[in-house]
């Protein structure tokens, strides 16, 4: 059985992640009254390539059959929410598009796509923009997240 933990993520500007529509995550500042809108992730510890500082994880949305995945769209690595069969997921051997290398430095987390090395789960400086897969070449986008555990 795969081991999972529930958590919330905020970007380096303390923007929370919320579900916009069915298949899109957006990052925005929430106030105390609507903090419950932020998504709770189920972080599953899955099989992946051996590395001292990278831990392979899959990121599902708690209570939904949705997982973050990385695919090529219009010749560009793209982050999407993908619907899965709840009877088969999560599993220890997740397909590579679902796998992110969790990199942790002093309580800050980065999530690198296993499918597309050097591409990271990213947020924009701008409010209410979609969470996306970025290669951080511009330097403006945010790839560091803080994590808060949530009771299962």
């Amino acid at each position: 059985a795969v081991r999972s933990l529930h958590c919330r993520l905020q970007d380096a500007q303390q923007k929370s992640l919320v579900l916009s529509g069915t298949y899109e995550l957006k990052a925005l500042h929430l106030n105390a009254e609507n903090l419950n809108q932020q998504v709770v992730f189920s972080m599953s510890f899955v099989q992946g390539e051996e590395s001292n500082d990278k831990i392979p994880v899959a990121l599902g949305l708690r209570g939904k059959n949705l997982y973050l995945s990385c695919v090529m769209k219009d010749d560009k690595p793209t982050l999407q929410l993908e619907s899965v069969d709840p009877n088969r997921y999560p599993k220890k051997k997740m397909e590579k598009r679902f796998v992110f290398n969790k990199i942790e430095i002093k309580d800050k987390l980065e999530f690198e796509s296993a499918q597309f090395p050097n591409w990271y789960i990213s947020t924009s400086q701008t409010e209410y923009m979609p969470v996306f897969l970025g290669n951080n070449s511009g330097g403006q986008d945010l790839i560091d997240f803080s994590m808060e555990f949530v009771s299962s």
């Epitope: 059985a1 933990l5 529930h6 309580d107 555990f149 299962s152």
Partner: antibody, heavy 120, light 107 residues
Framework: QVQLVQSGAEVKKPGASVKVSCKVS????????IEWVRQAPGKGLEWIGE????????NYNEKFKGKATITADTSTDTAYMELSSLRSEDTAVYYC?????????????WGQGTLVTVSS | DIQMTQSPSSLSASVGDRVTITCKAS??????LSWFQQKPGKAPKSLIY???RLVDGVPSRFSGSASGTDYTLTISSLQPEDFATYYC?????????FGQGTKLEIK
């Protein structure tokens, strides 16, 4: 540096309960599982269960469900394991240990152990 | 439960010897395998995690390897302080399970 300091030895009568503590320092308490392991006299090591103080998640060895209750107090960075309905076969040294929340680092640090003796 | 079959149960060796201790897992444990050293009256000491990663401060004469579901701890050149009991642990599936232990004694 990381330290796990356990409570002192206990002598209990059969049927009684005992609560063993494990006070940690030197790391972020909420981010590490606290593991509990027992070792009966002259025997090997046996895993009892674990708690992640950051969210209260607990996993037990089925063998110890109903025997052991694991808790954690984040205000004092202390984990506890209570053993109930003690019998002579519960006589053992009980250890706490730690593992990072993502399970990558193994049971790196250990407490000094707490000897629980059950005798009438 | 996953069984960890550790061998040998005891081993006599001399200072300077190369020794190997093996644990066989009853199923795949995805490299979640640690080795511990324990001396009488003391808590276990972590040596190796994730099959081959050395814990900080552990001498390089200790090493770990894997072949399928067989896991090996090797001490390349025994030192007097290495005589102790060694345990493996799988922490991939609940309940986590230890090997029965290998007592390493002076020949």
């Amino acid at each position: 540096q990381v330290q796990l300091v356990q409570s002192g030895a206990e002598v209990k009568k059969p049927g009684a309960s005992v609560k063993v503590s494990c006070k940690v320092s030197g790391y972020t308490f909420s981010r590490y599982w606290i593991e509990w392991v027992r070792q009966a006299p002259g025997k090997g090591l046996e895993w009892i269960g674990e708690i992640l103080p950051g969210n209260g998640n607990i996993n037990y060895n089925e063998k110890f469900k109903g025997k052991a209750t694991i808790t954690a107090d984040t205000s004092t960075d202390t984990a506890y394991m209570e053993l109930s309905s003690l019998r002579s076969e519960d006589t053992a040294v009980y250890y706490c240990s730690t593992i990072y929340y993502d399970y990558d680092q193994g049971f790196t640090y250990w407490g000094q152990g707490t000897l629980v003796t059950v005798s009438s | 439960d996953i069984q960890m079959t550790q061998s040998p149960s005891s081993l006599s060796a001399s200072v300077g010897d190369r020794v190997t201790i093996t644990c066989k897992a009853s199923q795949d444990i995805d490299r979640y395998l640690s080795w511990f050293q324990q001396k009488p009256g003391k808590a276990p000491k972590s040596l190796i995690y994730r099959v081959k990663r050395l814990v900080d401060g552990v001498p390089s004469r200790f090493s770990g390897s894997a072949s399928g579901t067989d896991y090996t701890l090797t001490i390349s050149s025994l030192q007097p302080e290495d005589f102790a009991t060694y345990y493996c642990l799988q922490y991939d599936e609940f309940p986590y399970t230890f090997g029965q232990g290998t007592k390493l004694e002076i020949k």
